[in-house]
């Protein structure tokens, strides 16, 4: 058993039929010695008396809020949560496996630049009685600070018969050094509690590997005289690290016909303009990627050819 | 060339070669790795890999103030990786083709380090490890890990030279 936060405890249980469970001793936080009784949740049934209560925790019915009282007055509470270990593996019932970039990916994170700010998100089909708490650090043995906000519900989607809920959190490295070569990964730890079930999820990454720039901005076309060619120009996204002479992007320009089957023409350039042939009903799209490190491409920014 | 006394390197040449290094490093090991990131060895092990750290003056402001600290650090890393790519980790079994991206990478690391430091002037360099694995599959695993680290190192070096070429070239 260990303390998650004040008056909230996690009991780790090997979860199999007829498992013996864990013996837990609860102590009432009071100077009182006599006349103390214990109850569980909203029940008025007295479970025991005395300053300590010994219970055998085997299943979710044994978890919950234990309260010690004296003469009708509440003295203190202890909330017991269960963390299930099935066949040697901690349960992952609360979050959905996103399966990208590999199986058992429950947390996904992205950064728009090298400032040390990043966003992580996760999915669940659970809609109520759900809380998350996020901690992060750079490195684990001598951790350096990363501050995370509160996790918030960021999207709801319908997937077949199920509703899927996306939660996200923003974190910021306290003393970020955008120009340095990372040698220690960022660690992200999410505590998830659904009713009386506790689970934890972790992710480990370098900022450089989760970079995904915003799409290029101000995408414009300038027809060239007496030609089917146009000059496409764009700018670095506002969210990208500066100066751009240091934090450079490379770009992919694509001409795409109305039909997905039509051949796509692609040009790669380090400049913020390119000359392409604009076909009727086609559109021109541009996306960006770090010039020197092959992390993710941005989403496309597009304009119609007409 | 960065000569003793601190004159400027050939920023544009360095920019071109460092950008080529980035391309080669990714063609040598194209996977964006999902290797285990925690490189925790056992009790007595030390991490000897030269990283470009926060205090090395490789940020835009540091380069403007005095680029020598940063160039020295980059040179140290280039020599370290050049020696690694020439070591039995890469020359042993399983063999690489003579014109493989790793061979080109090795030559380009040497080329860039020579651009930064002319003959006769020596910055201190890091020793490469002596305890070498005996098995081909151990070497293969280390090659992946070394190339992943090299990708990160040359990316920072390329940013430095791009910025230098744009803002510090005479």
């Amino acid at each position: 058993i260990w303390e998650l936060k004040k008056d909230v405890y996690v009991v780790e249980l090997d979860w199999y039929p007829d498992a013996p469970g864990e013996m837990v001793v609860l102590t009432c936080d009071t100077p009182e010695e006599d006349g103390i009784t214990w109850t569980l949740d909203q029940s008025s049934e007295v479970l025991g008396s005395g300053k300590t209560l010994t219970i055998q925790v085997k299943e979710f019915g044994d978890a919950g809020q234990y309260t010690c009282h004296k003469g009708g007055e509440v003295l203190s509470h202890s909330l017991l949560l269960l963390h299930k270990k099935e066949d040697g593996i901690w349960s992952t019932d609360i979050l959905k496996d996103q399966k990208e970039p590999k199986n058992k990916t429950f947390l996904r994170c992205e950064a728009k630049n090298y400032s040390g700010r990043f966003t992580c998100w996760w999915l669940t089909t659970i809609s109520t009685d759900l809380t998350f708490s996020v901690k992060s650090s750079r490195g684990s043995s001598d951790p350096q600070g990363v501050t995370c906000g509160a996790a918030t519900l960021s999207a709801e989607r319908v997937r077949g018969d199920n509703k899927e809920y996306e939660y996200s959190v923003e974190c910021q490295e306290d003393s970020a050094c955008p120009a340095a070569e990372e040698s220690l990964p960022i660690e992200v730890m999410v505590d998830a509690v659904h009713k009386l079930k506790y689970e934890n999820y972790t992710s480990s990454f370098f900022i450089r590997d989760i970079i995904k720039p915003d799409p290029p901005k101000n995408l414009q076309l300038k027809p060239l005289k007496n030609s089917r060619q146009v000059e496409v120009s764009w700018e670095y996204p506002d969210t990208w690290s500066t100066p751009h002479s240091y934090f450079s992007l490379t770009f992919c320009v694509q001409v795409q016909g109305k039909s997905k089957r039509e051949k796509k023409d692609r040009v790669f350039t380090d400049k913020t303009s390119a000359t392409v042939i604009c076909r009727k009903n086609a559109s021109i799209s541009v996306r960006a990627q770090d010039r020197y490190y092959s992390s993710s491409w941005s989403e496309w920014a597009s304009v119609p050819c007409s | 060339r960065a000569v003793p006394g601190g004159s400027s390197p050939a920023w544009t040449q360095c920019q071109q070669l460092s950008q080529k290094l980035c391309t080669l490093a990714w063609s040598a090991h194209p996977l964006v790795g999902h290797m285990d990131l925690r490189e925790e060895g056992d009790e007595e092990t030390t991490n000897d890999v030269p990283h470009i750290q926060c205090g090395d003056g490789c940020d835009p402001q540091g380069l403007r103030d005095n680029s020598q600290f940063c160039l020295q650090r980059i040179h140290q890393g280039l020599i370290f990786y050049e020696k690694l790519l020439g070591s039995d980790i890469f020359t042993g079994e399983p063999s690489l083709l003579p014109d493989s991206p790793v061979a080109q990478l090795h030559a380009s690391l040497l080329g860039l380090s020579q651009l930064l430091q002319p003959e006769g002037h020596h910055w201190e360099t890091q020793q490469i490890p002596s305890l070498s694995p005996s098995q081909p599959w151990q070497r293969l695993l280390l090659r992946f890990k070394i190339l992943r680290s090299l990708q990160a190192f040359v990316a920072v070096a390329a940013r430095v030279f791009a910025h230098g070429a744009a803002t510090l070239s005479p």
Epitope: S183 | G33, H34, M35, D36, R38, E39, E40, G41, D42, T45, T46, N47, D48, V49, L84, I89, I128, P129, L131, S132, P133, S134, Q135, W137, Q138, L140, L141, L142, F144, K145, I146, S149
Partner: antibody, heavy 127, light 108 residues
Framework: QVELVQSGAEVKKPGSSVKVSCKAS????????ISWVRQAPGQGLEWMGI????????YYAQKFQGRVTITADESTSTAYMELSSLRSEDTAVYYC????????????????????WGQGTLVTVSS | DIVLTQSPATLSLSPGERATLSCRAS???????LAWYQQKPGQAPRLLIY???RRATGVPARFSGSGSGTDFTLTISSLEPEDFATYYC?????????FGQGTKVEIK
């Protein structure tokens, strides 16, 4: 704390196959490399092969090549060793063992020395 | 294959005495690639020494390893009751990674 827990004893007929499992609990399975070592009754130790980690294929001792298959399932943190065409001289205790991590510069790699062992699985081959 | 020959096959000593176990290789083994294990009846082996002379985590200081090339030694400076067991050397220089046949340290 990582622990390696192996499947129970097996009695097999000559010519058949046996599949022994080894479950790692605690720690990061993907960074652990599991070898298989056997010990015939009253005899010494014999290395059979190593299960694939990230980026490597299974690697076998020549003696067992073609008869042994070593696999790993990262999702269940379990390594498996399957030995086919069993004969009486395959009667032994089969151990899974984790490679100690060596360091080359700043990069870890598995040494072929074993710092954590399963409890062993006795496989008896008898007609 | 590299053959490792351990001697003596059995060593009879009393608690408090010094034990010297030998492991000889049929061809040169880099000292980076030699390990020693302890095994008690009914138990799995336990790594004691790796890289010929480095003690594994939690191994008492009375165990020490030395040697290079073809001759390696495991020394137990003062035998404790729990040290009576069989000891194996192992080379990882060449495949197959071979073990010696073992030295049994028994109470005299």
């Amino acid at each position: 704390q990582v622990e390696l827990v192996q499947s129970g004893a097996e009695v097999k007929k000559p010519g058949s196959s046996v599949k022994v499992s080894c479950k790692a609990s605690g720690g990061t399975f993907s960074s652990n490399y599991i070898s298989w070592v056997r010990q015939a009754p009253g005899q010494g130790l014999e290395w059979m092969g190593i299960s694939p980690g990230t980026g490597i294929n299974a690697y076998y001792a020549q003696k067992f090549q073609g008869r042994v298959t070593i696999t790993a399932d990262e999702s269940t943190s379990t390594a498996y060793m399957e030995l086919s065409s069993l004969r009486s001289e395959d009667t032994a205790v089969y151990y899974c063992a984790r490679s100690k991590k060596g360091m080359y510069g700043g990069w870890t790699y598995p040494l072929m020395m074993f710092d954590l062992w399963g409890q062993g699985t006795l496989v008896t081959v008898s007609s | 294959d590299i053959v490792l020959t351990q001697s003596p096959a059995t060593l009879s000593l009393s608690p408090g005495e010094r034990a010297t176990l030998s492991c000889r290789a049929s061809q040169s083994v880099s000292s980076n690639y030699l390990a020693w294990y302890q095994q008690k009846p009914g138990q799995a082996p336990r790594l004691l020494i790796y890289y010929a002379s480095r003690r594994a985590t939690g191994v008492p200081a009375r165990f020490s390893g030395s040697g290079s090339g073809t001759d390696f030694t495991l020394t137990i400076s003062s035998l404790e009751p729990e040290d009576f067991a069989t000891y194996y050397c192992q080379q990882t220089s060449n495949t197959p990674f071979t073990f010696g046949q073992g030295t049994k340290v028994e109470i005299k």
